[in-house]
């Protein structure tokens, strides 16, 4: 039975050219996290963090994605095209997979605010 919940940074906004931290947190379960996949709105994978094998950043994102903090992901040099949904998939044993959603809005405006409150989707 899957008892856990994924908390995410929810809807966030950040400045074009700036950076943003995408963060998910799995709580309320004793399941062991074996892997976390970070996926973009078009289903392309940004990065994978395997508990035993470490991080893999996909080549297309190598220059703009930094692993961490923790199981999160830092997206750098933001462009307007980065606006959209991001998903974290937690592969766990024995529960199975949990999925969280973050919506990132990249703004031209210098008043863009990077809100980092956690939300339960």
């Amino acid at each position: 039975m899957m008892t856990g919940t994924i908390e995410t940074t929810g809807n966030i906004s950040a400045k074009k050219g700036g950076s943003v931290i995408l963060q998910c947190h799995l709580s309320s379960t004793m399941a062991q996290v074996t892997q976390v996949n970070w996926e973009q709105h078009d289903h392309s994978l940004l990065a994978i963090r395997n508990a035993e094998l470490g991080w893999h950043i996909y080549p297309a994102f190598k220059d703009r994605v930094a692993p961490g903090p923790g199981l999160g992901l830092t997206l750098q040099s933001l462009t307007m095209n980065d606006t959209g949904e991001y998903f974290c998939t937690y592969h766990t044993y024995p529960d199975g997979t949990y999925r969280g959603r973050i919506f990132l809005e990249v703004l031209e405006s210098s008043v863009a605010e990077h809100s980092a409150r956690f939300q339960i989707p």
Epitope: T34, N37, H43, I48, E52, L53, T89, H91, T97
Partner: antibody
Framework: QVQLVQSGAEVKKPGASVKVSCKAS????????MHWVRQAPGQGLEWMGV????????SYAQKFQGRVTLTRDTSTSTVYMELSSLRSEDTAVYYC??????????????WGQGTTVTVSS | EIVLTQSPGTLSLSPGERATLSCRAS???????LAWYQQKPGQAPRLLIY???SRATGIPDRFSGSGSGTDFTLTISRLEPEDFAVYYC?????????FGGGTKVEIK
């Protein structure tokens, strides 16, 4: 061309250990992960584990945790799979398989010819 | 872990016929993280398809893969004598990576 050549057949007694080798050629050995998969007589395929290019990182299927050890020797471009505390159910053909990508994608692109391990008293 | 169920267990067909093999996952395999392998008696498996529909190097175009989510299909458009073998699907979305039980394609 890419080739994986495995060591010869082994007959072992229950409780013993076996070490199977897999010698790689035709590619940059230090750029790819190597998987191990086994197949019991008349049965399907079962993933056992994977080892990283440098040998520093390994990941094992829960079922084999504590009983299987993967190592690699860069000087001879060889990967080893050692399985301990053998029982009759470990009688199988053991395959090494090189990953398709420069990380642990899980796509097993090139396979060794297989090594038959028979466990019998 | 993700369990893959292949059907049918055995497919009896004649050369020149079309073969359709099915693979169903116990949970969604996102981004089509599914591969197909062919294995002939006494030989190692051979990668045919990855990403659900991309053919591996050197694989003839009579082999095609399709599907997403939990339902995937391998199609052999016109069976050649060398295609009679066992076919396995494998997911590489969620560790541990798992294989289906296989479908044997035999000569009718």
């Amino acid at each position: 061309q890419v080739q994986l050549v495995q060591s010869g057949a082994e007959v072992k007694k229950p409780g013993a250990s076996v070490k199977v080798s897999c010698k790689a050629s035709g590619y940059t050995f230090t750029s790819y992960y190597m998987h191990w998969v086994r197949q019991a007589p008349g049965q399907g395929l079962e993933w056992m584990g994977v080892i990283g290019p440098s040998g520093a990182s390994t990941s094992y299927a829960q079922k084999f945790q504590g009983r299987v050890t993967l190592t690699r020797d860069t000087s001879t471009s060889t990967v080893y799979m050692e399985l301990s505390s053998l029982r009759s159910e470990d009688t199988a053909v053991y395959y090494c398989a090189r990953d398709h990508s420069d990380y642990w994608s899980g796509i097993m692109e090139v396979w060794g010819q297989g090594t038959t391990v028979t466990v019998s008293s | 872990e993700i369990v893959l169920t292949q059907s049918p267990g055995t497919l009896s067909l004649s050369p020149g016929e079309r073969a359709t093999l099915s693979c169903r996952a116990s949970q969604s395999v996102r981004s089509s993280y599914l591969a197909w392998y062919q294995q002939k008696p006494g030989q190692a498996p051979r990668l045919l398809i990855y990403g659900a529909s991309s053919r591996a190097t050197g694989i003839p175009d009579r082999f095609s893969g399709s599907g997403s989510g939990t339902d995937f299909t391998l199609t052999i458009s016109r069976l050649e004598p060398e295609d009679f073998a066992v076919y396995y699907c494998q997911q590489y979305f969620s560790p541990p990576w798992t294989f289906g039980g296989g479908t044997k394609v035999e000569i009718k």
